[in-house]
């Protein structure tokens, strides 16, 4: 699977994670920071 | 499967206001952005701008800056695009558009006539 | 605002030429690119994303290539169910349409 950064209007789409952009899916994908879950890493889990 | 589904078309007067509706289903619109485009009769294509659903951020086109109101109800899955002080030049087919899950996913389109 | 500089805004041509539709960002738009075909009464169709890559279903007579600012369409051999209205959108920084170019058959 070919990937990249995530372009400069996807900054703040993951709220705490890295934006990977999945090219040939055609979509953005957060990578979460530990402790956090969801599509853009927005919910906060213990 | 994953759908956009638009207001239907509207008929306004110059100087009035018209607000467009786009209710997803299928996918939560908080997990995307929803952008808004524009087309005039036989014109190009016009990127009017997006919000985050999540967050509620927007970002408007110069052009349209003042004019434009793009929000989100995220308890019904739907975005509005309000555009304002309307002229014969905002005769267009509006559509929204999702991104970030996937690329650039359109909605019907929606046929604003502005005539007096 | 990035601008972009879609040319030509129209073009005829011969059943299996090739035709070759050019963009010109204003800046560097790190290859995040896409080109739309629009056929009238409908709305736009997606055929090609991140400059290059060809979506779902797309014949592979279409192709993009490019980088920095410049960037180019092209179709290989063109068919008669290719005539449509094609743009260029960049979308690194917000969103920019290019003017579109008018394919036609000569």
């Known amino acids: 699977v070919s990937i990249t950064k995530c372009n400069s209007d996807m900054n703040g789409y993951c709220l705490h994670g890295q934006c990977i952009y999945l090219v040939d899916m055609s979509q953005n994908y957060c990578r979460c920071e530990v402790g956090y879950t969801g599509v853009r890493c927005e919910h906060f889990y213990l | 499967q994953d759908q956009l589904v638009q207001s239907g078309a509207e008929v306004k007067k110059p100087g009035a206001s018209v607000k467009v509706s786009c209710k997803a289903s299928g996918f939560n619109i908080k997990d995307t952005y929803i952008q808004w485009v524009r087309q005039a009769p036989g014109q190009g294509l016009e990127w009017m701008g997006r919000i985050d659903p999540l967050t509620g951020q927007t970002k408007y086109q110069e052009k349209f800056e003042g004019r434009v109101t793009i929000t989100a109800d995220t308890s019904t899955n739907t975005a509005y695009m309000e555009l304002s002080s309307l002229r014969s030049e905002d005769t267009a087919v509006y559509y929204c558009?999702?991104?970030?899950?996937?690329?650039?996913?359109w909605g019907q389109g929606t046929l604003v006539t502005v005539s007096s | 605002d990035i601008q972009m500089t879609q040319s030509p805004s129209s073009l005829s041509a011969s059943v299996g030429d090739r035709v070759t539709i050019t963009c010109k960002a204003s800046?560097?738009?790190?290859?995040?690119i896409a080109w739309y075909q629009q056929k009238p009464g409908q709305a736009p169709r997606l055929l090609i994303q991140y400059t290059s890559t060809l979506q779902p279903g797309v014949p592979s007579r279409f192709s993009g290539s490019g980088s920095g600012t410049d960037y180019t369409f092209t179709i290989s051999s063109l068919q008669p169910e290719d005539i449509a209205t094609y743009y260029c959108?960049?979308?690194?920084?917000?969103?920019?349409f290019g003017g579109g170019t008018k394919v036609e058959i000569k």
């Open positions: 959108l960049q979308y690194d920084n917000l969103r920019t």
């Open positions: 800046q560097d738009i790190h290859k995040y």
């Open positions: 558009v999702r991104s970030g899950t996937s690329f650039d996913f």
